[in-house]
Interface confidence: low
């Protein structure tokens, strides 16, 4: 057992049929030494008596909120949770495995640029008495700090029958350092809570590795006389590192008809403009990449031929 | 190039080549980013790769301080990781294929940093480990690190000598 | 703990020299920036100098360029300060204080209790 | 003159919000780098405050909150205790003098 916050406990299970479960004792909180009793929830029967309470964890049924009174007046609350553990495996029943970029992700985290910002976001389709904590470091040894914000309900979707959930978090490298390289990942933790079943959740990455900028901004046609060629120029996302001399993006550039079948012609180039041919009905689309690694190209930004 | 008075190297040189390398690490190992290699254990092989770190001045306002400090860091991880591939962990088994980036990528580490440092002054370079793995899937394994080391020091080192080469070219 | 103590002040005529001393202990002394920072008498703080973690950069107020020295000995856990062509608005308080990252820029959380320099003739 | 500016005195009574301004330019906190703040006691070394504009470390009471507008940075003390008289120091980098620098401080009384 071990606590989680003020009050709150885990208790770790292996859950097995017929498990003996963990002896649990929980302490009044009080100066108190007599006629003190104790009870679960909201129920009033009385489970024992005394500054100690000695209980066998090995259910849900065991788990919850007990209340130590006196008198009628309630002295102190320690909340029980349990942390399942099935064949050497903890539980990871509250939130989605999004299977991407392989199977067993759960957490999946982006950074639009190196200022040490990024955010994380889970997949639920749980909608109620559910709660998430988030803790973040660089490094776990000698970990270095990384503040977190509040985990908020960032989308609802529904996939056949079921609603989806999906919550996120964004969080800072408190001494965030843009230029260097780095050499200690950065470790996500998220403790989920649902009900009285309690699971954590972890990811470790580098930031240079989840880095998708913003796509290009201002992207503009501009036809050449007597030619079908235009030429399309854009700049930086607002929210790419700067300086651009030395947080370099390199772009590609594609026309896409207006049939998904129809060939593309794509271009690749470090510069913010490019020769085109644009044809009817065609679209022009232009995304971003970190020049020197390879992380995620951005999304794309498009505008008509027309 | 970086001599001993301290005077600028040919940044735009560097900036190509440095750029080249950036392409040759990713083509020499493509796939390795759907790999989480930080779960595969073994971490004493990889930890003591020299690291461009936050005070080795080479952020855009350490450069125009003095460019120095951050150009001999990346001349250390030069050598340090030629030396790396020219090593049994990329020459023994299991084999390269032929047309293998890693050639290619060895000898132009190998050239840049003979920009930055001329014939007859040296800086000091950083000891290689000794890196023997007796298994081949262990050279794999390491092979793939090193690489995934190999890309994030030349993201920074490209960084570096474009800035150079846009702000701080004679 | 955590803890910086300076040494080296005292009273010195100008245009001498004089070399405060840092000791610290209780953190990993080789990983963090150091900065010297001074207060004349009834005066505000005014920063001197830093270096970083390892020694390879320093940067100095433009008020004792050429004149002052930082350096450090990570083998002793110790930060100096040489002070040359001492002048009389040098005289303050030094205090050495330790950043809270690798480089500058993350504020300084552990100070010592400070050394006083006068430059008097 | 100091780089950033702070105003000489602000006072309060006990259990009031003072807030302490620090006004720089866009070399420095206009330029987006971080401020941090110091508490200094006459006789004895300051200690830090608020660090990366709007943390508070470890053992700083959370009556101390930093934030950041534009060129300018503040720290608002709520419910004023007497022990909080001091002298308070802002301090950021400034890109222009590749220099730390502090603020000229303001000196808190507290009245009563």
């Known amino acids: 057992i071990w606590e989680l916050k003020k009050d709150v406990y885990v208790v770790e299970l292996d859950w097995y049929p017929d498990a003996p479960g963990e002896m649990v004792v929980l302490t009044c909180d009080t100066p108190e030494e007599d006629g003190i009793t104790w009870t679960l929830d909201q129920s009033s029967e009385v489970l024992g008596s005394g500054k100690t309470l000695t209980i066998q964890v090995k259910e849900f049924g065991d788990a919850g909120q007990y209340t130590c009174h006196k008198g009628g007046e309630v002295l102190s609350h320690s909340l029980l949770l349990l942390h399942k553990k099935e064949d050497g495996i903890w539980s990871t029943d509250i939130l989605k495995d999004q299977k991407e970029p392989k199977n067993k992700t759960f957490l999946r985290c982006e950074a639009k640029n190196y200022s040490g910002r990024f955010t994380c976001w889970w997949l639920t389709t749980i909608s109620t008495d559910l709660t998430f904590s988030v803790k973040s470091s660089r490094g776990s040894s000698d970990p270095q700090g990384v503040t977190c914000g509040a985990a908020t309900l960032s989308a609802e979707r529904v996939r056949g029958d079921n609603k989806e959930y999906e919550y996120s978090v964004e969080c800072q490298e408190d001494s965030a350092c843009p230029a260097a390289e780095e050499s200690l990942p950065i470790e996500v933790m998220v403790d989920a809570v649902h009900k009285l079943k309690y699971e954590n959740y972890t990811s470790s990455f580098f930031i240079r590795d989840i880095i998708k900028p913003d796509p290009p901004k201002n992207l503009q046609l501009k036809p050449l006389k007597n030619s079908r060629q235009v030429e399309v120029s854009w700049e930086y996302p607002d929210t790419w590192s700067t300086p651009h001399s030395y947080f370099s993006l390199t772009f590609c550039v594609q026309v896409q008809g207006k049939s998904k079948r129809e060939k593309k012609d794509r271009v690749f180039t470090d510069k913010t403009s490019a020769t085109v041919i644009c044809r009817k009905n065609a679209s022009i689309s232009v995304r971003a990449q970190d020049r020197y690694y390879s992380s995620s190209w951005s999304e794309w930004a498009s505008v008509p031929c027309s | 190039r970086a001599v001993p008075g301290g005077s600028s190297p040919a940044w735009t040189q560097c900036q190509q080549l440095s750029q080249k390398l950036c392409t040759l690490a990713w083509s020499a190992h493509p796939l390795v980013g759907h790999m989480d290699l930080r779960e595969e254990g073994d971490e004493e092989t990889t930890n003591d790769v020299p690291h461009i770190q936050c005070g080795d001045g080479c952020d855009p306002q350490g450069l125009r301080d003095n460019s120095q400090f951050c150009l001999q860091r990346i001349h250390q991880g030069l050598i340090f990781y030629e030396k790396l591939l020219g090593s049994d962990i990329f020459t023994g088994e299991p084999s390269l294929l032929p047309d293998s980036p890693v050639g290619q990528l060895h000898a132009s580490l190998l050239g840049l940093s003979q920009l930055l440092q001329p014939e007859g002054h040296h800086w000091e370079t950083q000891q290689i480990p000794s890196l023997s793995p007796s298994q081949p899937w262990q050279r794999l394994l390491l092979r793939f690190k090193i690489l995934r080391s190999l890309q994030a020091f030349v993201a920074v080192a490209a960084r570096v000598f474009a800035h150079g080469a846009a702000t701080l070219s004679p | 703990q955590v803890q910086l103590v300076e040494s080296g002040g005292g009273l010195v005529k100008p245009g001498r020299s004089l070399r405060l001393s840092c000791a610290a202990s209780?953190?990993?002394?080789?990983?963090?920036?150091m900065h010297w920072v001074r207060q004349a008498p009834g005066k505000g703080l005014e920063w001197v100098a830093v270096?970083?973690?390892?020694?390879?950069?320093?940067y100095y107020a433009d008020s004792v360029k050429g004149r002052f020295t930082i350096s450090r000995d990570n083998s002793k856990n110790t930060l100096y300060l040489q002070m040359n062509s001492l002048r009389a608005e040098d005289t303050a308080v030094y205090y050495c204080?330790?950043?809270?990252?690798?480089?500058?820029?993350?504020?300084?959380?552990?100070w010592g209790q400070g050394t006083t320099v006068t430059v008097s003739s | 003159q100091s780089v950033l500016t702070q105003p000489p005195s602000v006072s309060g009574a006990p259990g009031q919000r003072v807030t302490f301004s620090c006004t720089g330019s866009?070399?420095?906190?206009?330029?987006?780098?971080?401020v941090h703040w110091y508490q200094q006691f006459p006789g004895r070394a300051p200690k830090l405050l608020i660090y990366?504009?709007?943390n508070r470390p470890s053992g700083v009471p959370d009556r101390f909150s930093g934030s950041k507008s534009g060129a300018s940075a503040s720290l608002a003390i709520t419910g004023l205790q007497v022990e909080d008289e001091a002298d308070y120091y802002c301090?950021?980098?400034?890109?222009?003098?590749?220099?730390?620098?502090f603020g000229g401080g303001t000196q808190l009384t507290v009245l009563g």
């Open positions: 204080a330790k950043e809270k990252g690798m480089v500058r820029g993350y504020g300084m959380d552990v």
């Open positions: 209780g953190f990993t002394f080789s990983s963090y920036a």
């Open positions: 270096i970083s973690y390892d020694g390879s950069n320093k």
């Open positions: 866009d070399s420095n906190i206009g330029a987006g780098y971080d």
């Open positions: 990366g504009t709007n």
């Open positions: 301090q950021t980098f400034d890109t222009r003098l590749i220099a730390s620098v």
